[in-house]
């Protein structure tokens, strides 16, 4: 019997599945090389990293930045740091210029006007 | 239009606010609400650590609440554990 997945579990499953969709393509099946990472960013983060996607060097710099153990590959542990940072940045954008009481969300990363 | 991955990231924000809005301090999840979050949103292998242990680990600025940044540490740890588990499952098959 499989339990019904919670909202958070579904979100995490999407992250894992996306990672695996690209990691299995070349070389080690559970790490992203530079080509796999670039493709993932170009296709699956086309809105969140819209500006960055215009410059390949910036994407290379992002990969280098995430590659904590400097092995030129991204493990899932390193990749999820990108997911968390983008989530934080999106949340910040939703609250940009917030003042006064109440809790309202404006569009997050990649939504509305850039 | 946002991709599935981008929607999932924004949906993580919604999960946090489901619990931060309980007490009305929109960017704070208190101990008892973290317990609810763990029970509702997290699998057994995350829950078994216990809400108090998680709270101590996540409240890095020791202000008695889990802010959004601190909640993301839970998401990272849960993600890493789920990823590991996904490989264990596939090895079983």
């Amino acid at each position: 019997m499989t339990c019904k997945m919670s909202q958070l579990e579904r979100n995490i499953e999407t992250i894992i599945n996306t990672f695996h969709q690209y990691s299995v393509k070349l070389g080690h099946p559970d790490t992203l090389n530079q080509g796999e990472f670039k493709e993932l960013v170009r296709k699956d983060l086309q809105n969140f990293l819209k500006k960055e996607n215009k410059n390949e060097k910036v994407i290379e710099h992002i990969m280098e930045d995430l590659d904590t153990n400097a092995d030129k590959q991204l493990s899932f542990e390193e990749f999820i740091m990108l997911m968390a940072r983008l989530t934080w940045a999106s949340h910040e954008k939703m609250h940009e210029g917030d003042e006064g009481p109440g809790h309202h969300h404006k569009p997050g990363l990649g939504e509305g006007t850039p | 239009m946002l991709t599935e991955l981008e929607k999932a990231l924004n949906s993580i924000i919604d999960v946090y606010h489901k619990y931060s809005l309980i007490k009305g301090n929109f960017h704070a999840v208190y101990r008892d609400d973290l317990k609810k979050l763990l029970e509702t949103e997290c699998p057994q292998y995350i829950r078994k650590k216990g809400a108090d242990v998680w709270f101590k680990e996540l409240d890095i600025n020791t202000d008695g609440a889990v802010n959004f940044q601190e909640f993301l540490i839970l998401v990272i740890k849960m993600g890493v554990a789920a990823h590991k588990k996904s490989h264990e499952e596939s090895h079983k098959e």
Epitope: N69, M81, R85, L86, A89 | I73
Partner: antibody
Framework: PELVKSGASVKISCKAS????????INWVKQSNGKSLEWIGL????????FYNQKFKGKATLTVDQSSSTAYMQLNSLTSEDSAVYYC????????????WGQGTTLTVSS | ASLAVSLGQRATISCRAS??????????MNWFQLKPGQPPKLLIY???KQGSGVPARFSGSGSGTDFSLNIHSMEEDDTAMYFC?????????FGGGTKLEIK
Amino acid sequence: PELVKSGASVKISCKASGYSFTDYNINWVKQSNGKSLEWIGLINPNYGTTFYNQKFKGKATLTVDQSSSTAYMQLNSLTSEDSAVYYCARETLLLRYFDYWGQGTTLTVSS
Amino acid sequence: ASLAVSLGQRATISCRASESVDIYGISFMNWFQLKPGQPPKLLIYAASKQGSGVPARFSGSGSGTDFSLNIHSMEEDDTAMYFCQQSKEVPRTFGGGTKLEIK
């Protein structure tokens, strides 16, 4: 405070407690003449990966002992220029800021 | 650099990075306060987020290369050195510091 002879080496330790040691980077910072702050380098205790300020390459060596949750910085071939206060600082991995600092070790190099 | 501000007045300290410190939509710019005989104290992280236990009179703003630290009402206790620091990449770097004094 450490009083060391010129030309010698010193190993400064930084013991972490109250948190998961591998969840944060450890950075080392030099404070000279009570004023300026200089970043020496960082170590990721999870992987043991180190990054150094070019200026301190060959001067400083960063290591960690996971079993005792302790970070170390060895400084070699000491000169009077190395006399300073040395701090270790914990850095959050997500947003990368130094949220907790050690009390500092005062190093005096005597000729 | 040094700055003298009267008690109760606003103090603004600026910091310019040689290149953008933004990545992932986050500005990796932090501010520290340094007092004699004490370790540096985090005031602001990610350009505008307040550190733990930091008085509300301290705020940070900016993105890209230009940042500022504001103290909206100067108090005696705020006499100190203030440093900006980028954590976008290694080497992490600190600004030269600004000495804030009472006028």
